[in-house]
Interface confidence: low
């Protein structure tokens, strides 16, 4: 009924995100772009600045219901492939040409910005069909906090806390070390507890990248890294 919760897509601020809208139809007319069109609209979460709406240049497109306050056209592809949207067209908002020919009208945000959060509504007009997709994008901030912070000395301890601003807990947490992402397990030198990693006695060998991967029940995962600095024996 009305007020039904929209499916939620999570994104990590600064990472790419895919907003799905697909027919998965193998027999889509290859001339789709000459005869059909796509409109993606965004209604930012309350509290976000509302961008200036663009002139809609999609002649021949179905006119979506009167936009709610703050809703604007992010991107539209009119019949013939003419693109329009918020001016200037934001390069981080993309539709993939190859995908359109396969019936995939998904929007890519490369990267996701905090201001991208909110409701998204796509209307796709095909020669003999009209498809609509709706979802809610939530953009979370990832961080790794070290206590104590700053440069460490030999035999100091440090506690790393990996966090992402999402209300539910991750279903799994994996820690790794170094550019090669060598997995870190519980040992006398590493104590793992959920999103925390304790190094009780650091050495110069511990300098460098430490990271975690948080995985959530919907399959979304976020990778966070921290550069640890440990002074040598000088």
């Amino acid at each position: 009924g009305p007020g039904k919760e929209l499916p939620v897509v999570w994104a990590q601020e600064g990472a790419p995100v895919h907003l799905p809208c697909s027919l998965k139809s193998p027999n889509l007319d290859p001339n789709f772009l000459r005869r059909g069109g796509v409109i993606w609209q965004h209604q930012p979460d309350s509290g976000q600045p509302t961008p200036i709406p663009a002139l809609d240049l999609h002649q021949g497109m179905p006119s979506p219901r009167q936009p709610a306050p703050g809703r604007y056209t992010v991107l539209s592809v009119a019949p013939g492939g003419l693109r329009s949207g918020r001016q200037p067209l934001h390069p981080h908002v993309q539709l993939e040409e190859r995908g359109l020919q396969r019936g995939d009208f998904s929007l890519w945000l490369r990267p996701a910005l905090r201001t991208d959060a909110g409701e998204y509504h796509a209307t796709v007009r095909l020669p003999n069909r009209a498809l609509s997709c709706s979802l809610r994008l939530r953009v979370g901030q990832a961080s790794m906090i070290a206590s104590p912070s700053g440069v460490l000395k030999l035999s100091d301890w440090v506690l790393l806390n990996c966090s992402f601003s999402r209300p539910d807990r991750p279903v799994s947490v994996h820690w790794f070390q170094g550019q090669n992402r060598v997995p870190v397990y519980n040992s006398p030198r590493h104590f793992l507890a959920e999103t925390f990693l304790l190094l009780p006695q650091v050495s110069p060998l511990d300098s460098g990248t430490w990271g975690c991967v948080l995985t959530y029940r919907d399959g979304f995962n976020v990778s966070i890294t921290y550069n640890l600095k440990v002074l040598g024996l000088e």
């Epitope: 039904k4 929209l6 499916p7 809208c21 697909s22 027919l23 998965k24 139809s25 193998p26 498809l131 609509s132 997709c133 709706s134 979802l135």
Partner: nanobody
Framework: QVQLVESGGGVVQPGGSLRLSCAAS????????MGWFRQAPGKERELVAA????????DYADSVYGRFTISRDDSKNTGYLQMNSLRAEDTAVYYC??????????????WGQGTLVTVSS
Amino acid sequence: QVQLVESGGGVVQPGGSLRLSCAASGLTLSQYTMGWFRQAPGKERELVAAIHWTSSVTDYADSVYGRFTISRDDSKNTGYLQMNSLRAEDTAVYYCAATHYYTHRGPFDYWGQGTLVTVSS
């Protein structure tokens, strides 16, 4: 045993409205993509509208876009097709169907018996 039972058909004048219902038993409609099809005499069955199980994706035939609205009430395990501004060419037997496929491009597994809609002055 799965059953889909349509109701709400009847005779209506051009420009009038009807609301078709599809009551499901033996399956949870909110876990399926639901479609409304119609078949006019001497014509092939065609997909009129479909709603993905998330309720976030709807799809309409061009001929009914803006006039028909598909919806679902999960608490009643029932789907609906609200038909406004009816035309003579909308006269057909209307069937509801359900599929487990992600989109309604896959085959529909379950079908109702149909309800007749006649638009005539």
